[in-house]
Interface confidence: low
Amino acid sequence: CKAMHVAQPAVVLASSRGIASFVCEYASPGKATEVRVTVLRQADSQVTEVCAATYMMGNELTFLDDSICTGTSSGNQVNLTIQGLRAMDTGLYICKVELMYPPPYYLGIGNGTQIYVIDPEPCPDSDF
């Protein structure tokens, strides 16, 4: 397994609708045709997988139907969007990139993006 550099923003603030987007960029040492991107969440020293997608270079990034993530790829950049976030989901979101094919296998893990989620204030009931 060979190491690879992955860059991602340090901080992102989720929108009032609970949507956070960030770019994950990797320094590809070779001409990979198959790439796997995994988003990990680290909170209270526990790491959990948020979502993952495998894609062929030049094709769209397809997450599973049950995933809260969507994304697009452009060259060595992956634009990730995480939806449905609430305040309790605030944490460090780490981008992990694997160059699956052809060999050799490369693995890169970013330093993480701290996503802050603030639950919107409830709107007062309206008479009209």
Epitope: E49, D65, D66
Partner: antibody
Framework: QVQLVQSGAELKKPGASVKVSCKAS????????MDWVRQAPGQGLEWIGN????????SYNQKFKGRVTITVDKSTSTAYMELRSLRSDDTAVYYC?????????????WGQGTLVTVSS | EIVLTQSPATLSLSPGERATMSCSAS?????MHWFQQKPGKAPKLLIY???ILASGVPARFSGSGSGTDYTLTISRLEPEDFATYYC?????????FGQGTKLEIK
């Protein structure tokens, strides 16, 4: 109505390859992923991998990595699953099954299955 | 890989009785999907997204659960319900199925 029709049973020797076809009809072929699942005799279900017929991007179960290739022929709305370096424990019924999307049911449609027997 | 463990492996009941089977995931999943399979036949989608009945599935079937623990319930068994039931997760690759619960006539 949606139909997935698979190719017939195959008898193969260890080390050989098999290519199973799955012809789809009754829907727009490129709108849904096609998955492949297998079931060894008396055993449970095991996911092999899938393909997006539009982009032809694939995802495979790492267990089969390097031995399996899933392809499509968009002109005939047919998906193919090729498994190489066959072993006796690859003896199973192989199913193609149509994926869904966020607003649809997943794996609601299945082919009739193709029995692949690996024996010397 | 998310491992799904179904229990019990075999459930022996009589028609008219209530059947409850479980599916436990090794890590949290978003939804659970359930399939019914009869000998020599392809699996049939029963419930998707934890609790949504697939087209044509009778209302005696229901699904529930969240996180790592999910349940399939058949409120009143009919003779045609005796089959093997599989749970499946689509939260992360590889997609995985449980080993199955065989529902047999007592």
């Amino acid at each position: 109505q949606v139909q997935l029709v698979q190719s017939g049973a195959e008898l193969k020797k260890p080390g050989a390859s098999v290519k199973v076809s799955c012809k789809a009809s009754g829907y727009t072929f490129t709108d849904y992923n096609m998955d492949w699942v297998r079931q060894a005799p008396g055993q449970g279900l095991e996911w092999i991998g899938n393909i997006n017929p539009n982009s032809e991007s694939t995802s495979y179960n790492q267990k089969f990595k390097g031995r399996v290739t899933i392809t499509v022929d968009k002109s005939t709305s047919t998906a193919y699953m090729e498994l190489r370096s066959l072993r006796s424990d690859d003896t199973a019924v192989y199913y193609c099954t149509r994926d869904g999307n966020r607003y649809d049911a997943w794996f609601a449609y299945w082919g009739q299955g193709t029995l692949v027997t690996v024996s010397s | 890989e998310i491992v799904l463990t179904q229990s019990p492996a075999t459930l022996s009941l009589s028609p008219g009785e209530r059947a409850t089977m479980s599916c436990s995931a090794s890590s949290s999943v978003t939804y659970m999907h359930w399939f019914q399979q009869k000998p020599g036949k392809a699996p049939k989608l029963l419930i998707y997204s934890t609790s949504i009945l697939a087209s044509g599935v009778p209302a005696r079937f229901s699904g529930s659960g969240s996180g790592t623990d999910y349940t399939l319930t058949i409120s009143r068994l009919e003779p045609e319900d005796f089959a093997t039931y599989y749970c499946q997760q689509r939260t992360s690759y590889p997609l995985t199925f449980g080993q199955g619960t065989k529902l047999e006539i007592k």
